[in-house]
């Protein structure tokens, strides 16, 4: 007349080495496993009863140890991976728009000795700022007197009037903004005179894009004469190095 080995629990372990058989009336003591602590008033022992079964322990009296509460960082949020601060869990940090994280994005609640502690210090959310954007030759940008630019602040470049008969063209993005990595969204543009040669075609003629002169991004369309076919593209664009792209087509019989 005996009980078999006592039941095992996730959060508790026997205080003594288990035996294969226990006499009726024999009692075993449990203790909380590492990382768990006792939560009174639940029992922590079990008895081998006359039916040769162990008297049940209705609720586990041990609960996981928890790391201390970490509030939301200023200008950000702390999000628990599965709703509790108990060890083995993770705390994720995100910053509001316009702020970036300094420190670890994830903290882990882990055991150190018998205590549950966070894997590091909570991060902080710092305002995103950009240095003033580059100055450019033959042009300027808005807010040129501002020293510090915040997230999504934008500046717009424009070209100066040219000293000669041909204007400066703005090559690149005219508007750039302060990005979340504290860098500007694009390189500063360039202001320079871009003028393509007059697009002449033999055995054909221009049918669209007429102009006095052909500056940056000017587009010209050609048509062949009767009995000829176009070699190349009928549409060309003046590119930033003052050449036609694709080149001026030819017309052949």
């Amino acid at each position: 007349d005996a009980c078999g080995p006592p039941p095992t629990f996730e959060a508790m372990e026997l205080t003594s080495k288990p035996k294969p058989y226990y006499k009726v009336g024999e009692q075993v003591e449990y203790d909380c496993k590492k990382g768990y602590h006792h939560f009174a008033p639940f029992l922590t022992h079990s008895i081998c009863d006359r039916n040769h079964t162990w008297l049940p322990i209705s609720d586990e009296p041990c609960v996981k140890k928890v790391c201390h509460y970490i509030p939301n960082p200023l200008h950000g949020e702390a999000i628990l991976a599965n709703g509790s601060y108990s060890f083995g869990n993770q705390l994720h940090f995100i910053c509001n728009d316009g702020y970036y994280l300094i420190g670890k994005e994830i903290l882990y609640c882990e055991l150190k000795g018998s205590d549950a502690v966070w894997s590091g210090r909570p991060p902080i959310c710092q305002k995103i700022v950009c240095k003033p954007p580059p100055k450019i030759n033959n042009g300027k940008h808005t807010f040129s007197d501002v020293e510090v630019f915040e997230y999504l602040d934008a500046v717009t470049y424009s070209c100066d009037p040219a000293p000669g008969p041909d204007p400066f063209s703005l090559i690149g993005e005219s508007t750039i903004y302060c990005r979340d990595n504290s860098l500007w969204s694009d390189d500063a543009p360039e202001c320079k005179v871009v003028k393509c040669r007059f697009p002449v075609i033999e055995n054909g003629k221009q049918i669209a894009g007429f102009g006095k002169k052909f500056y940056y991004k000017a587009t010209v369309i050609f048509e062949r004469d009767k009995g000829f076919h176009i070699i190349g593209s009928d549409t060309i664009v003046c590119n930033s190095n003052s050449t036609w792209d694709p080149p001026v087509p030819k017309c052949a019989k």
């Epitope: 040669r197 007059f198 003629k205 221009q206 007429f210 002169k213």
Partner: antibody, heavy 119, light 107 residues
């Protein structure tokens, strides 16, 4: 200022050839195209063709292909036009004129060279 | 090629007059038209390019206008040094072609 100095008058026999010159000064020679224009006595102007000194590319009036050959010598900033197999129809004043970036208007002209074809 | 016609081969005007010289193209030339002046001594000058743009150094009494096939050069206040032959030139299509010229004389 831009100046184009053309060579002096030529008296040539029918069937012969002649080489006219146009020396440019006052600007960067390779920046402008050189055009050649013909004017028969008491007549209007006829465009012969152009040459781009920077890369030696050229365009001719179909009518003058085989009659005129355009060349340049960038070292002396001089443009040349060779006229071949001359006939009395080629008796004319020949002008050189510059145009910028291939834009076909001619802001600066030489004084002209008179070519007379006569036996 | 495109034919350029200057129907008036010569015209007389008095000093101070407003003079208009016409030029028509055998097909539309989309404002790709220039005007030149040739003095009696043979020297040639560009006056107007792209229909109405005044070349630098040209007096403002010269102006150009037109569209499609019909173009004109106007001298608003005729001066003695304007005595010359005036040529139009198209450049929409190769070969570039000139009008036959209009000779301007003083009455």
């Amino acid at each position: 200022q831009v100046q184009l100095q053309q060579s002096g008058p030529e008296l040539v026999k029918p069937g012969a050839s002649v080489k006219l010159s146009c020396k440019a000064s006052g600007y960067t020679f390779t920046n402008y195209d050189i055009n050649w224009v013909k004017q028969r006595p008491g007549q209007g102007l006829e465009w012969i063709g152009w040459i781009y000194p920077r890369d030696g590319s050229f365009k001719y009036n179909e009518k003058f292909k085989g009659k005129a050959t355009l060349t340049v010598d960038t070292s002396s900033s001089t443009a040349y036009m060779d006229l071949h197999s001359l006939t009395s129809e080629d008796s004319a004043v020949f002008f050189c004129a510059v145009s910028e970036d291939g834009y076909p208007w001619f802001p600066y002209w030489g004084q002209g060279t008179l070519v007379t074809v006569s036996a | 090629g495109i034919q350029m016609t200057q129907t008036t081969s010569s015209l007389s005007a008095s000093l101070g007059d407003r003079v208009t010289i016409s030029c028509s193209a055998s097909q539309g030339i989309s404002n790709y038209l220039n005007w030149y002046q040739q003095k009696p001594d043979g020297t040639v000058k560009l006056l107007i390019y792209y229909t109405s743009s005044l070349h630098s150094g040209v007096p403002s009494r010269f102006s150009g206008s037109g569209s499609g096939t019909d173009y004109s050069l106007t001298i608003s206040n005729l001066e003695p040094e304007d005595i010359a032959t005036y040529y139009c030139q198209q450049y929409i299509k190769l070969p570039f072609t000139f009008g036959s010229g209009t000779k301007l004389e003083i009455k």
